[in-house]
């Protein structure tokens, strides 16, 4: 009944020597105000987009079967840095972060923070800075302002600086991150730590006693066992996407989140494919209302951590690595030397209460079925600000188990699978390039999504 | 003055390995990045990755991955190409040149290093 | 990755005229492209970096424009030195690939 996702976003600078351009001044108090609705949604897209970015280059790269993390704490980490950035290098994470409005993105980034799914979410952001390191006040006071980071002197002793540090993380991430750095490099001057804890609880709850041992197939061939969540009657907003074809559903979450899974009907598919022609509308059209539905979905633990410095010099973020300009943040020049990232994720049927009302009345309504036995990708999103907050893909959510052949019977192979979507209808209402919206009708349709 | 002086013309056989180095002078080495560029005979140019020389670490074009390394003798202000296993279509000129953040631009290049493999 | 189409391949004009090289990018690269000329056995050299701003010791007669995905490189008044190789490369999302290059001759 519950997932919880720890991620956290260390950024860790060094000494650089001077070089330079003259600084730019964004006016003060321009970017004081509350976001208003129309800027909150171009904040929503413009994250979709990073989002899309950055996962696809990260899968790309990664040889693991799964995959998670939160492009909302990199965002972050990317735009308190943003704060002290000027000329080129502002402009460019502005880029990066498809920021149109550029210098409020951190003011709006961590007021729209501050109002995420009250108990669901806390976000802890931390400067350790280097002892006697001359750090403008003005960033100073920013940063506590809008990020609520208290700036900590380092000691100078690498153990007692990392035992410090992964205290900071382990408590930040109530327990759910408990060895972030294993080292400190000795030149370190200035390091941004960013810590999302979330915890969503289902609006609906799975009952414990319909677990059951099933099959998620990993290709054509083969199979692993998962321990799979089963509902009879789950309301859920769910559509069929065009082009390629994937099925998408709201899971909706207490706290105004949901979890959305893509599930794409190939198997041979891979991140940047799906995400190409992905955008936030795409994920929330209009119209499609939660209906009564038949749902399996495994139960899962994820974790990953990564390294994001190949990954965001290759978005376009080369310079800060090699040369910055963050004269916003001290005259003595400094080079982001690491960026490091972890997010976990827990999906089980454990938690509160269920909506039993909502269950009941939409029984009464005719049956479909959602099952998440393949490889998919997934999103969970703030509704309110519809911010992505985490984005992670699963090829096998039981690794260690042996793989099994598939019997020739069971086999939900793309024949058998695609066939049982001939009776399914298709909308021609077109959302972006190449990808239409097939949204479930009031009829009966054959089993959709279920292996037989 | 700036320069970028690459070592001289190399003659190889197809499966042996060759390195061409280009030494950085009249500025700060760290602070600028190192790209490397393949010019096959009468072709374009090609870009094969840089090399960020405050952290050493490399990023290479597709095509660029498995037999080429760069790497980094920083004290002497250095940058290296490495290739491997040489096959005859990597006969080319290979030149090193400088990346100015912020200019986003190679403003500076080596003289080139001419790589001939053949048996 | 981002493609980088140039065109002309190659091009003939007379000392005096005016021509445009073009180079249109797959992707939004903002205004980060660079332009280069090269003569035959030379190293590369920077003509224009940012798609407009001219490279200390360049000629006025060279201008660079554009931005997104399409650009060009004007050469006012061409002059003997002009006839060579340009070539355009995005410095965006990484490979910084350059386009196919032009082949400017003397008619």
């Known amino acids: 009944n519950q997932e919880q996702v720890s991620p956290l976003t260390l950024l860790k600078l060094g000494n650089q020597e001077p070089g330079g351009q003259t600084a730019l001044k964004s006016p003060p108090g321009v970017c004081s105000r509350d976001p208003t609705p129309e800027q909150t949604h171009r904040l929503a897209r413009a994250m979709m987009a990073f989002t899309a970015d950055l996962f696809s280059l990260v899968a790309q790269t990664s040889t693991c079967p799964n995959l998670i993390l939160s492009p909302l704490s990199v965002a972050l980490a990317l735009s308190h840095l943003a704060l002290g950035a000027q000329n080129h290098t502002l402009q460019r994470l502005q880029q990066v972060l498809h920021a149109g409005s550029g210098p409020c993105l951190p003011h709006l980034l961590s007021r729209l923070c501050q109002d995420l799914g009250p108990g669901a979410f806390r976000l802890a952001a931390r400067m350790y800075l280097q002892k006697g390191f001359p750090i403008k006040e003005d960033f100073l006071e920013q940063s506590e302002q809008l990020f609520g980071a208290k700036p900590v002197s380092l000691t100078g002793k690498q153990e007692d600086d990392l035992a410090n540090i992964n205290q900071w993380v382990k408590e930040a991430t109530e327990g759910k991150i408990q060895e972030f750095l294993s080292g400190l490099p000795e030149d370190t001057v200035l390091l941004l730590l960013n810590a999302i804890h979330f915890q969503g609880f289902w609006r609906n709850k799975f009952d414990p006693s319909l677990t059951q041992r099933d099959s998620f197939h990993l290709d054509e061939q083969f199979t692993v066992p998962v321990e799979m969540m089963q509902a009879r009657t789950y309301p859920l907003r769910w559509f069929l996407l065009e082009q390629p074809e994937i099925q998408v559903a709201h899971f909706p979450f207490k706290n105004n989140m949901s979890f959305v899974v893509l599930v794409p009907t190939h198997f041979e598919w891979n991140v940047s494919q799906v995400l190409a022609n992905l955008s936030w509308d795409t994920l929330h059209p209009p119209l499609v209302w939660e209906r009564p539905t038949k749902v399996r979905l495994p139960k899962l633990y994820l974790k990953h951590q990564m390294d994001l410095v190949a990954t965001l010099s290759q978005l376009g973020l080369q310079e800060l690595f090699q040369a910055p300009d963050l004269r916003g943040i001290s005259e003595q020049s400094l080079v982001v030397s690491g960026v490091q990232h972890q997010s976990t994720l827990e999906l089980s049927e454990v938690g509160v209460e269920a909506a039993a009302a909502t269950s009941i009345a939409m029984s009464r309504m005719s049956l479909s079925s959602f099952s998440v036995n393949r490889p998919f990708l997934f999103f969970i999103f703030e509704d309110t600000t519809g911010l992505p907050l985490f984005v992670g893909s699963v090829r096998n959510p039981n690794p260690s188990a042996p793989r099994e052949l598939k019997e020739q019977q069971d086999s939900p192979g793309n024949k058998d699978f695609l066939q049982s979507l001939k009776g399914f209808p298709r909308g021609d209402k077109l959302f972006g390039p190449d990808l239409k919206l097939v949204p479930p009708m009031e009829e009966d349709y054959p089993q959709f999504g279920s292996p037989k | 003055q700036i320069q970028l002086v690459q070592s001289g013309p190399e003659l190889k056989k197809p499966g042996e390995t060759v390195k061409i180095s280009c030494k950085a002078s009249?500025?700060?080495?760290?602070?600028?990045?190192m790209n490397w560029v393949k010019q096959a005979p009468g072709k374009g140019l090609k870009w094969m990755g840089w090399?960020?020389?405050?952290?050493?670490?490399?990023t290479y074009a597709e095509e660029f991955k498995g037999r080429f390394a760069f790497s980094l003798e920083t004290s002497a202000s250095t940058a290296n190409l490495q290739i491997k296993n040489l096959k005859n279509e990597d006969t080319a000129t290979y030149f090193c040149?400088?990346?100015?953040?912020?200019?986003?631009?190679?403003?500076?290049w080596g003289q080139g290093t001419s790589v001939t493999v053949s048996s | 990755d981002i493609q980088m189409t140039q065109s002309p391949a190659s091009l003939s004009a007379s000392v005096g005229e005016t021509v445009t090289i073009t180079c249109r990018a797959s992707?939004?690269?903002?205004?980060?492209l660079a332009w280069y000329q090269q003569k035959q056995g030379k190293s590369p050299q920077l003509l224009v970096y940012?798609?407009?701003t001219l490279a200390d010791g360049v000629p006025s007669r060279f201008s660079g424009s554009g931005s997104g995905t399409q650009f060009s490189l004007k050469i006012n008044s061409l002059q003997p030195e002009d006839f060579g190789s340009h070539y355009c490369?995005?410095?965006?999302?990484?490979?910084?690939?350059f386009g196919g290059g032009t082949k400017l001759e003397i008619k």
């Open positions: 090399i960020n020389t405050k952290s050493g670490e490399p």
């Open positions: 040149a400088r990346w100015v953040p912020g200019t986003y631009a190679m403003d500076y």
């Open positions: 009249g500025y700060t080495f760290t602070n600028y990045g």
């Open positions: 992707g939004n690269i903002h205004n980060y």
């Open positions: 940012n798609a407009k």
């Open positions: 490369q995005h410095f965006w999302t990484t490979p910084w690939t």
